[in-house]
């Protein structure tokens, strides 16, 4: 018996088609993805093949003006229109708090939304009961398939789930649910979730009875053969893991931003064992037409967005590199721009002894969510900035000891190379890393821009000195594992909305050309 699994993950509000790098579509003939194009391909496969599931592995929320304006209602509406069969909760589904998940999505979705490792407590338990499930048994043709969900246990550090949701260890939580499915004589089980490729592989290895793992969160691109676009495969599609009980378990993920539709064909035997698995992500390029009815619906919903913010704020004459491939690995000019804007927004010349009260900025690379292409006449709009900074955060002022900053920079590279979001972009700081050294001892030079000076210059960080730093509220609250900031900050003053800070700076500068200039080495 053959099952076709179609899957998406980390779509991040890319309801409309995008450019190849998943930023705003500029030249429609070269654009990719979007729900209208996705629907065309999904329907084509549904017509051609008998047993098809369409699954989403989380993080539909957050990423463009669509989410800024519609706050999740757009996700429910268009996922319903595409007839998704199931979705796992991702960390970003909690970005507007639990209420921002319940009202627009959980109550409106016509498909099951899953997570086995999120447990509600207190008053929330009854309010959210039945709105998301640990698993769902779906009829597919003459068979049944169990889908069990999971969500990154790091979600409290990455989003705003509040205090009444407990995020358990994925493997510990999944096993009893899979066992329950087995007792219900469900012998074909898909783990669908949002914890990253490493955890996906662990689930495949450790959770007895899971036949297939469909993942997300790490934006992992897998491909067998010659890849069709710019993404470099992290491995073959599907990635095969040998489970502890000797089975070959296929693990898949489909990059991100709706650029690809994951396509996996699984052959099950009479006992529910995976006999074979093959497929590849399908690049949703312009060779696939956009479905006219979905496109018309998108255009209808688009009107409210057009009214929201399409006016030009300023111009860039350089490419603003906000790609994860850059900003999570090295100094990127988008990071420099944002940090410069953050400092500029906090210029307060209140003391003759100080050129400014604050000179330093840190910004988690994972918070930079999109590049901006200068080839659109250099135009920068609020909408462009909303794709770069989609989280609706604030840029805050904190006071930290030098020793805390040193810990933060060690944390920045403690697991360097895994494309994790804690890699810091900076302003008013020069940092030198030696990645050949062991984690926790990789910062070899950390110089900071003086404030108590008439001519700003860089001096070595002093461990016991107290410094003012501008940073995202996300970091001030210990996000991305920066617990030392939350635990050790001496003062915290909330600041202005992140997009507004950058848009004001661009409007003030009129033309910008940020460079990569050796802040991070």
């Amino acid at each position: 018996w053959e099952l076709t699994i179609l899957h998406t993950n980390d779509v991040h509000s890319r309801l409309e088609q995008t450019s190849e790098d998943s930023s705003k579509c500029v030249n429609a003939s070269r654009c990719m993805g979007g729900v209208a194009r996705l629907f065309t391909k999904v329907q084509q496969i549904r017509r051609a093949e008998p047993n098809v599931l369409l699954l989403d592995a989380g993080d539909q929320y957050q990423g463009t003006i669509w989410f800024t304006v519609y706050k999740g209602a757009e996700v429910a509406h268009f996922m319903n229109a595409l007839r998704y069969d199931a979705m796992a909760l991702g960390n970003h589904e909690f970005d507007n708090g639990v209420e921002g998940l319940i009202e627009p999505l959980l109550k409106e979705a016509k498909f099951p939304i899953l997570s086995a490792n999120i447990k509600a407590k207190g008053p929330l338990a009854s309010q959210i009961s039945g709105l998301y499930l640990p698993y769902k048994v779906l009829p597919v043709g003459d068979e049944v398939v169990g889908i069990v969900g999971y969500t990154s246990k790091e979600t409290p550090f990455l989003s705003n789930p509040g205090t009444n949701l407990v995020f358990e260890d994925e493997i510990t939580a999944l096993q009893p649910e899979v066992d329950k499915l087995k007792t219900l004589n469900v012998n074909k089980i898909i783990a669908l979730g949002h914890s990253g490729f490493e955890m996906d592989k662990l689930i495949a290895q450790k959770v007895r009875g899971v036949d297939v793992v469909v993942g997300g969160h790490s934006n992992t691109f897998l491909y067998t053969g010659n890849p069709p676009s710019k993404e470099v495969p992290a491995g073959k599609y599907p990635f095969i893991v040998t489970s502890d009980d000797g089975r070959k378990v296929p693990v898949v993920q489909a990059y991100a931003f709706g650029k690809y539709l994951g396509y996996l064909k699984i052959e099950f035997d009479e006992r529910g064992n995976v006999i074979s698995s093959h497929g590849n992500p399908i690049l949703l390029n312009s060779s696939i037409p956009e479905d006219p009815s979905i496109k018309a619906d998108i255009n209808k919903w688009r009107i409210k967005l057009d009214n929201y913010s399409t006016q030009e704020l300023g111009k860039t004459i350089v490419y603003l590199d906000g790609s994860s491939q850059s900003c999570r690995f090295r100094e990127c000019n988008m990071g420099n721009l944002i940090c410069d804007a953050m400092i500029n927004n906090n210029l307060r010349h209140t003391d003759e002894m100080f050129w400014n009260h604050v000179s330093m900025c840190i910004l988690n690379g994972g918070g930079i969510r999109s590049p901006i292409d200068e080839r659109n006449n250099g135009t920068i709009t609020w909408e462009n900035l909303a794709a770069v900074l989609p989280f609706g955060g604030t840029f805050d002022l904190v006071q930290l000891k030098g020793s805390t900053l040193k810990k933060a920079f060690e944390h920045s590279v403690h697991r360097y190379g895994q494309s994790t979001g804690e890699f810091l972009q900076v302003g008013g700081i020069h940092v030198v890393y030696d990645l050949s050294r062991k984690p926790g001892d990789r910062v070899v030079k950390l110089d900071v821009l003086c404030t108590k000076c008439r001519v700003p210059s860089y001096d070595p960080l002093k461990m016991d000195e107290v410094y003012k730093v501008i940073l995202p509220n996300f970091l001030a609250n210990g996000g991305d594992g920066f617990q030392m900031i939350k635990d050790e900050l001496l003062r915290h003053d909330s600041g202005d909305q992140d997009i507004n800070v950058v848009s004001t700076y661009i409007s003030k500068m009129k033309v910008i050309y940020p460079a990569v200039e050796g802040r991070i080495k």
Epitope: W1, D269, E270, I275, S276
Partner: antibody, heavy 113, light 106 residues
Amino acid sequence: EVTLKESGPVLVKPTETLTLTCTVSGFSLKSYGIQWVRQPPGKLLEWLGVIWSGGSADYNAAFISRLTISKDTSKSQVVLTMTNMDPVDTATYYCAGQYGSVWGQGTLVTVSS
Amino acid sequence: DIQMTQSPSSLSASVGDRVTITCRASQDIGDRLNWLQQKPGGAIKRLIYATSSLDSGVPKRFSGSGSGTEYTLTISSLQPEDFATYYCLQYAGSWTFGGGTKVEIK
């Protein structure tokens, strides 16, 4: 639990027709095929044929003229019919799942007058 | 038809021995190979499917490997209950079996 069980006569006379039934439980004949295999005493396993989930059948070329496999999906049963039986057809007859994950216990059919 | 050549046809081994059985297909069968165990009573049980995946309840001392036309079943440490006849079965086309390997006590 996924199981298969063969049933039918233990003794068949030469030239007669053998009819064996394979009763399936734990999975659907709408989704999976059934294979038939035999093993003469002390000899090797020999594939006879298969009926697919869609209802079509394939046969070993050596038996195509005298073998028919059919099914009744509603009863979860597959029937093997072999005509013109001969003493050399004495064997244990097995039905198995399409992928060989499950086998019947086998039924010994002796062809003798 | 695809022919399967299995060797050896029989072997004598002691408890604790490592045993290897091979099957060669007459053409590429793309990992669509099972290993079956038949005990003296006649009951047939699948041990390994898709070349290398272990069936539920099968001890980890059994392992399968191979690709293309060459496939191997290994018993890492032979146990008393492992004395039986083993067959390879290809399902890339119409089923064909190897000639069997009878594993006997030395």
